[in-house]
Interface confidence: low
């Protein structure tokens, strides 16, 4: 049976197709193609008589067709117009007529399609923002991808029923993008340039650092603030409700006790008009603030009576503090065995008596805060029991206390000494 | 039908002030954003500024020529726009367009007729 | 800010020949668009984003180019194509027009 093949079926525009033959019978006067379903004389393209080897152009002939002489028929530069049926009639021998119909689709060269907003600046959690992918092109699919991915579910994303226009019903800072839309045809796919959203957002509650509050006289203070914000938050620094400067970054140098006070960053976002303020309160004192817990080395915790001595050390890592120390809830020193050394670091008990037995801590203060030890037990026998060592009998090991404590015993001292 | 009609045009004197308006028909007024161009007599085009659509909260942006002189608004209700022009110079004679704006590529799919302003003492 | 230029600044031809308008950026650029102008007309939305047709602009119109250059040709040219035509490009917040190509007849 005579049929027609198109090779290829769909075909870009601008190039070309061949309707191909099978089946060709033999002992033919010759042919001719029509287009459309149906032989019409008003709509044939070309005849060919094989006996001539002539091939004659008919009503529909556009120069852009080519028969050969197997009865394939070439079309090139094909254009949407040529997207349809073509039928081909044989003409026999017997005079009798066969025909077979073909068809092929002409598809447009899809344009570079590009994305168009309703809201270049969409402020978040207020906006909705619609993306239509342009232009407009019958027979098109049109796809989107979010940050390179197809689209996510999401209750805030939408698109149209012909999924050209994706809609997000109500902006974040993180649906900025890069947005991409593609059509395709049966043929090729084409993507859009990215399109980045410029959402508006912020300024969110600023944040000072460092975090520091306590400072001493004599350094330099610098603060930095920072607000999440597009665009960028523009800062202002406020001391005790006064104006200071209009910048991101604050620096005293030198500062005294006078610059204590209330630090005010403010944060504001000159496209939407909000602002935020975040407060710190910043001490310069030489004092030390909030102090540490500090804590009680022996040289030993268990001594024979009337014969071993004991130091007992005061640890801390506070600066600008004073030291006590404290036995059976009484203030220390309490006899003239007990000795304080070190700015009050260490306390010395030599020799170790019978009522020297009992819990000891020390505590350290300044005229903000204190903070105590927990205690420490020193048992006093006087029998031969084995020795709880922590350090060296003779005390030789507390060089190592003391040399690691040097820096704080001087400033503890100083301290000590201009405070009381 | 999309119809977009200037009207207010006239003779004015180097620093005197007047407020063109545009009616628009034919489409959701709130959704596009609305420009005007002028065109000065016998000299190209030139784009003075635009106002965004309700979804951009009507934001407004002006050309560096215009900038604090013009000021554009729309009035939802009446689906007009209006260019208020103060301190105009000779050099602000024009024919004054508005137009339509597909969105933020400045495609101007509609043009109104255009309504003329003379500046002259 | 980009500078459109466009060439030649008059062209005349007569209908049935090819018109070519150019349209020069002075950095490269994705898209432009074109408008064409009658005298004492509002000018109209001819062709969008470089290559598209706007809604009832015949197909002998046809727009190309990329980065700098952009070209406005018209096939075969009939006598309600003798016009002004300018291209236009938009920077972030601000449109462009070239200062426009008059097509005239020979």
């Known amino acids: 049976q005579l049929t027609t093949e198109s090779m290829p079926f769909n075909v870009a525009e601008g190039k070309e197709v061949l309707l191909l033959v099978h089946n060709l019978p033999q002992q033919l006067f010759g042919y001719s193609w029509y287009k459309g379903e149906r032989v019409d004389g008003n709509r044939q393209i070309v005849g060919y008589a094989i006996g001539t080897q002539q091939a004659t152009p008919g009503p529909a002939n556009s120069g852009r067709e080519t028969i050969y002489p197997n009865a394939s028929l070439l079309i090139q530069n094909v254009t949407q117009n040529d997207t349809g049926f073509y039928t081909l009639q044989v003409i026999k021998s017997d005079l009798v007529n066969e025909e077979a119909t073909g068809q092929f689709h002409v598809y447009p060269e899809l344009p570079k399609p590009f994305i168009t907003s309703n809201n270049s600046n969409p402020v978040e959690d207020e906006d909705a923002v619609a993306l239509t992918c342009e232009p407009e092109i019958q027979n098109t699919t049109y796809l989107w991808w979010v940050n390179n991915q197809s689209l996510p579910v999401s209750p805030r994303l939408q698109l149209s029923n012909d999924n050209r226009t994706l809609t997000l019903l109500s902006v974040t800072r993180n649906d900025v993008g890069p947005y991409e839309c593609g059509i395709q045809n049966k043929l090729s796919v084409d993507h859009s340039d990215p399109v980045i959203l410029n959402v508006l957002y912020g300024p969110d509650d600023p944040t000072i650092s460092p975090s520091y509050t306590y400072y001493r006289p004599g350094v330099n203070l610098s603060l930095s603030c920072h607000a999440a914000s597009n665009p960028p938050a523009q800062y202002s620094w406020l001391i005790d409700g006064n104006i200071q400067q209009h910048t991101q970054e604050l620096f005293i140098s030198n500062i005294t006790e006078k610059n204590s006070g209330l630090y005010t960053c403010q944060a504001n976002n000159s496209a939407s008009g909000h602002s935020r303020t975040t407060v710190k309160t910043i001490t310069v004192s030489a004092l030390s603030p909030v102090v540490a817990k500090p804590q009680i080395k022996a040289s030993k915790t268990t001594v024979t009576g009337d014969k071993d001595s004991v130091n007992l050390t005061c640890s801390t890592n506070d600066t600008g503090i004073s030291i006590r120390w404290f036995f059976k809830n009484q203030s220390l020193p309490s006899s003239e065995r007990m000795k304080l050394s070190q700015g009050n670091i260490t306390l010395s008990i030599n020799p170790v008596k019978r009522e020297d037995a009992g819990t000891y801590w020390c505590e350290v203060f300044n005229p903000i805060s204190k903070n105590q030890s927990d205690p420490i037990m020193l048992n006093v026998n006087y029998n031969a029991l084995p020795q709880e060592n922590l350090i060296n009998v003779d005390g030789s090991g507390l060089n190592d206390i003391f040399e690691a404590q040097k820096i704080e015993w001087h400033e503890a001292r100083a301290h000590h000494h201009h405070h009381h | 039908e999309v119809q977009l009609l200037e009207s207010g045009g006239g003779l004015v004197q180097p620093g005197g002030s007047l407020r063109l308006s545009c009616a628009a028909s034919?489409?959701?007024?709130?959704?596009?954003?609305m420009n005007w161009v002028r065109q000065a007599p016998g000299k190209g085009l030139e784009w003075l500024g635009f106002?965004?659509?309700?979804?951009?909260?009507?934001?407004?942006e002006y050309s560096a020529s215009v900038k604090g002189r013009f000021t554009i608004s729309r009035d939802k209700s009446k689906n007009t726009l209006y260019l208020q022009m103060n301190s105009l110079r000779a050099e602000d004679t024009a024919t004054y367009y508005c137009?339509?704006?597909?969105?933020?590529?400045?495609?101007?799919?509609?043009w109104g007729q255009g309504t003329t302003v003379t500046v002259s003492s | 800010e980009i500078v459109l230029t466009q060439s030649p600044a008059t062209l005349s031809l007569s209908p049935g020949e090819r018109a070519t308008l150019s349209c020069r950026a002075s950095s490269s650029v994705t898209y432009i668009h074109w408008y064409q102008q009658k005298p004492g007309q509002a000018p109209r939305s001819w062709i969008y984003?470089?290559?598209n047709l706007a809604s009832g602009i015949p197909a002998r119109f046809s727009g190309s180019g990329s980065g700098t250059d952009f070209t406005l040709t018209i096939s075969s040219l009939e006598p309600e194509d003798f016009a002004v035509y300018y291209c236009q490009h938009w920077s972030s917040k601000s449109p462009t027009f070239g200062q426009g190509t008059k097509l005239e007849i020979k």
């Open positions: 984003a470089t290559s």
């Open positions: 106002i965004g659509n309700k979804a951009n909260a009507y934001t407004t």
């Open positions: 137009t339509r704006d597909r969105g933020i590529r400045f495609q101007f799919d509609y």
């Open positions: 034919g489409f959701t007024f709130t959704d596009y954003y």
